[in-house]
């Protein structure tokens, strides 16, 4: 079958309250079929390629296990299998100033070099 | 051929801890997400958690991870699961399990035995 | 977490017979289901994964199907080691979750 191109699927918006727990779902397809060599799954806030990270985890060739690297106030959880082209990440104890735009990118590395992030991120509403 | 050799059973007070251990052996070890799978008597099964040998690197289910310690030694590749303030309901079999990969896609390729531990006072 | 459902929870089929177990997500998993037998004090055995794909030495007589939510395991014609109990797993979230499980009989 011909190789997928790089896309990453976002809802808009994802609404939820102060003091709960919202998740922001992110999945993506890309052209590097069978791939399983090292990975890098990050979210962050504000703006694309740019705004501060919130979320970062890498994972070793061969492994699914995505190990956290940051994980801004210990508030952020991926759900997602990035193997299995899902970022999906959990926020929880939602705070007012978590009201903005999220982006998730993954990278992958060793014998493939290729990255890819979400342009328009989803908006993540805390009322 | 791969074969991953898990120790016997044990019988625990609650309040005690367990540690079980799984000897991996016909693959290269640090390779490998090693999963642990426990099975309640006459229940299904559930997923407690990983380790990626290469790296030490850990993931866990949040329903254990205050009581859960996966770790593994390299040098004898064998993988362990310590559970801690064991309960009744922890009377359980414990399983290892190797994370296989085939172009792409990761399965549950070799299971141990399976450890029984129960937990009684 | 996802909870994954099965249906039935047991299936009683005459040898030579079509067994079907049906697997239901809480939520999309994509194509991200494995599929395991058991029998009686022995450990799980890998029979499909990636929702279709059958491993290594399985027989061809066990087939899945499925995406998103809705999954199938069948057995196009039952022999006599097939029973056991089957369960299903996704592994698209994490923690990774199993059906409760289907138990396989001889009618």
């Known amino acids: 079958s011909p190789a997928q191109r790089w896309s990453m699927q976002v809802p808009p918006e994802v609404s939820a309250e102060a003091g709960d727990a919202a998740v922001l779902p992110c999945t993506f397809t890309h052209p590097h079929r069978h791939y399983d060599g090292p990975l890098t799954a990050i979210w962050r806030a504000g703006e694309p390629y740019a705004g501060p990270q919130v979320f970062r985890c890498a994972a070793a060739r061969g492994s699914e296990l995505c190990q956290t690297a940051l994980s801004l106030h210990g508030r952020f959880r991926l759900l997602g299998n990035p193997r299995r082209n899902d970022l999906s990440l959990r926020v929880e104890r939602l705070a007012l100033a978590d009201d903005r735009r999220y982006f998730c990118r993954v990278e992958f590395a060793g014998d493939v070099h290729d990255r890819y992030e979400s342009r328009h991120g989803v908006r993540l509403h805390v009322t | 051929q791969v074969q991953l050799v898990q120790s016997g059973a044990e019988v625990k007070k609650p309040g005690a801890s367990v540690k079980v251990s799984c000897k991996a052996s016909?693959?290269?070890?640090?390779?490998?997400?090693v999963s642990w799978v426990r099975q309640a008597p006459g229940q299904g099964l559930e997923w407690m958690g990983v380790?990626?040998?290469?790296?030490?690197?850990?993931g866990y289910n949040e329903k254990f991870k205050a009581r859960v310690t996966i770790t593994v030694d390299t040098s004898t590749s064998t993988a362990y699961m310590e559970l801690s303030s064991l309960r009744s309901e922890d009377t359980a079999v414990y399983y290892c399990?190797?994370?296989?990969?085939?172009?792409?896609?990761?399965?549950?390729?070799?299971w141990g035995q399976g450890t029984l531990v129960t937990v009684s006072s | 977490d996802i909870v994954m459902t099965q249906s039935p929870d047991s299936l009683a089929v005459s040898l030579g017979e079509r067994a079907t177990i049906n697997c239901k997500a809480s939520?999309?998993?994509?194509?991200?289901v494995d599929w395991y037998q058991q029998k009686p004090g022995q450990p799980p055995k890998l029979l499909i994964y990636?929702?279709?794909n059958r491993y290594t030495g399985v027989p061809d007589r066990f087939s899945g199907s499925g995406s998103g939510t809705d999954f199938t395991l069948t057995i196009s014609s039952l022999q006599a080691e097939d029973v056991a109990v089957y369960y299903c797993?996704?592994?698209?979230?994490?923690?990774?979750?199993f059906g409760q499980g289907t138990k396989v009989e001889i009618k």
């Open positions: 399990a190797r994370r296989g990969l085939n172009k792409g896609y990761w399965f549950f390729d070799f």
């Open positions: 016909g693959y290269t070890f640090p390779r490998y997400d």
């Open positions: 380790i990626h040998p290469g790296s030490g690197g850990t």
């Open positions: 939520q999309n998993v994509g194509s991200n």
């Open positions: 990636e929702s279709t």
């Open positions: 797993m996704q592994s698209n979230f994490f923690p990774f979750t």
